[in-house]
Amino acid sequence: LQPGAEVPVVWAQEGAPAQLPCSPTIPLQDLSLLRRAGVTWQHQPDSGPPAAAPGHPLAPGPHPAMPSTRRHPPHRYTVLSVGPGGLRSGRLPLQPRVQLDERGRQRGDFSLWLRPARRADAGEYRAAVHLRDRALSCRLRLRLGQASMTASPPGSLRASDWVILNCSFSRPDRPASVHWFRNRGQGRVPVRESPHHHLAESFLFLPQVSPMDSGPWGCILTYRDGFNVSIMYNLTVLGLEPPT
């Protein structure tokens, strides 16, 4: 491999669907080849802690922990192999949470979907796309993060209390943008800076809550690579609703 060559990193949220993109460049005049294309996806899990090496997370069956004192890079294994006619193979039974979009495949999109993504799915993925006259390739590294929203102070609030909501995702770089919203009836209502709402990066400060603030609050973190995550928190403010 060329020194300094970077495997693209794809971020996903634990417990949410994850798309592992693969759309190799194919000249337009050759798109007819795609109907007979096959694809093989492989996964090399990230190295686990030295204590125990888990089994293949996307392979079915039990995953016995193998005692180990050293950090061995886990073996690469086949997640899914799809033949020209759409025939799926791999370790049986194939996990339903590992999916290829059949229509996408005929358009040159060989993306793998994990529904949902789990922590053990992190690692390097490679796809080999098998055509009649050439072999195409995709590589990426999947990183998984956990999303959370915390309230300080936690728990139920009383009218006129203050609260800070902190929206976070376990990723080292800062989000490019943070949008706050409230779920009201059928839609989302954006939360804007006002005397009642103070916005600072991933924090929302409510200086004086009222029972009307009870209910779901949400934030959307968007990163420079386009990855975004939506997080919800249910705020509880005790007290009588003011007369309307």
Partner: antibody, heavy 124, light 106 residues
Framework: QLQLQESGPGLVKPSETLSLTCTVS??????????WGWIRQPPGKGLEWIGS???????YYNPSLKSRVTISVDTSKNQFSLKLSSVTAADTAVYYC????????????????WGQGTMVTVSS | DIQMTQSPSTLSASVGDRVTITCRAS??????LAWYQQKPGKAPKLLIY???SSESGVPSRFSGSGSGTEFTLTISSLQPDDFATYYC????????FGGGTKVEIK
Amino acid sequence: QLQLQESGPGLVKPSETLSLTCTVSGDSISSSSYYWGWIRQPPGKGLEWIGSIFYSGNTYYNPSLKSRVTISVDTSKNQFSLKLSSVTAADTAVYYCAREDDFLTDYYGAFDIWGQGTMVTVSS
Amino acid sequence: DIQMTQSPSTLSASVGDRVTITCRASQSISSWLAWYQQKPGKAPKLLIYKASSSESGVPSRFSGSGSGTEFTLTISSLQPDDFATYYCQQYNSYLTFGGGTKVEIK
């Protein structure tokens, strides 16, 4: 360190089938993400690609040889094999096996590691 | 099928010379071209892939350029170890090699 070693008979009779095996050491074919190919070179001439195989069994072949070529893989032995049927004197060549890499690009096709080659003569 | 035409077929040069080998494809192959060096009785050695990317360990005097149908391999200052035969190979559709260019001592 990855090494490839071709093996098979050095002499084949016309009209018979040429059979060669490439043994891979230093990496597992079944857990690697490479294609594995066969290339030949007639004495004093240039290189000709024969075909390539992925560990999953997917192959693609030189169209001019396709009707006579079968490439297979045996992951349990970490080997891949070439069979070329109905040989003639024109099939006399040094036969190389090689690893086909994608180099973090969209396409496989460049051979970065080669065996040392084995000479096969077609003669009665 | 895509044909690859190399020129010249033989090239006489001296140590220190700048050497250029040309490879032409019968149709556009984008940048999917590799260059190899082969010495007598030895297997080919990959020098360049994707038209201009150097394989690790290859001396910096070797460089590749071009895209579409016209490609060149340049040796900026020929060294005694560089006298060999050079092949181009396309991998846009199937895999085909050029006829080779033998670089010999003038």
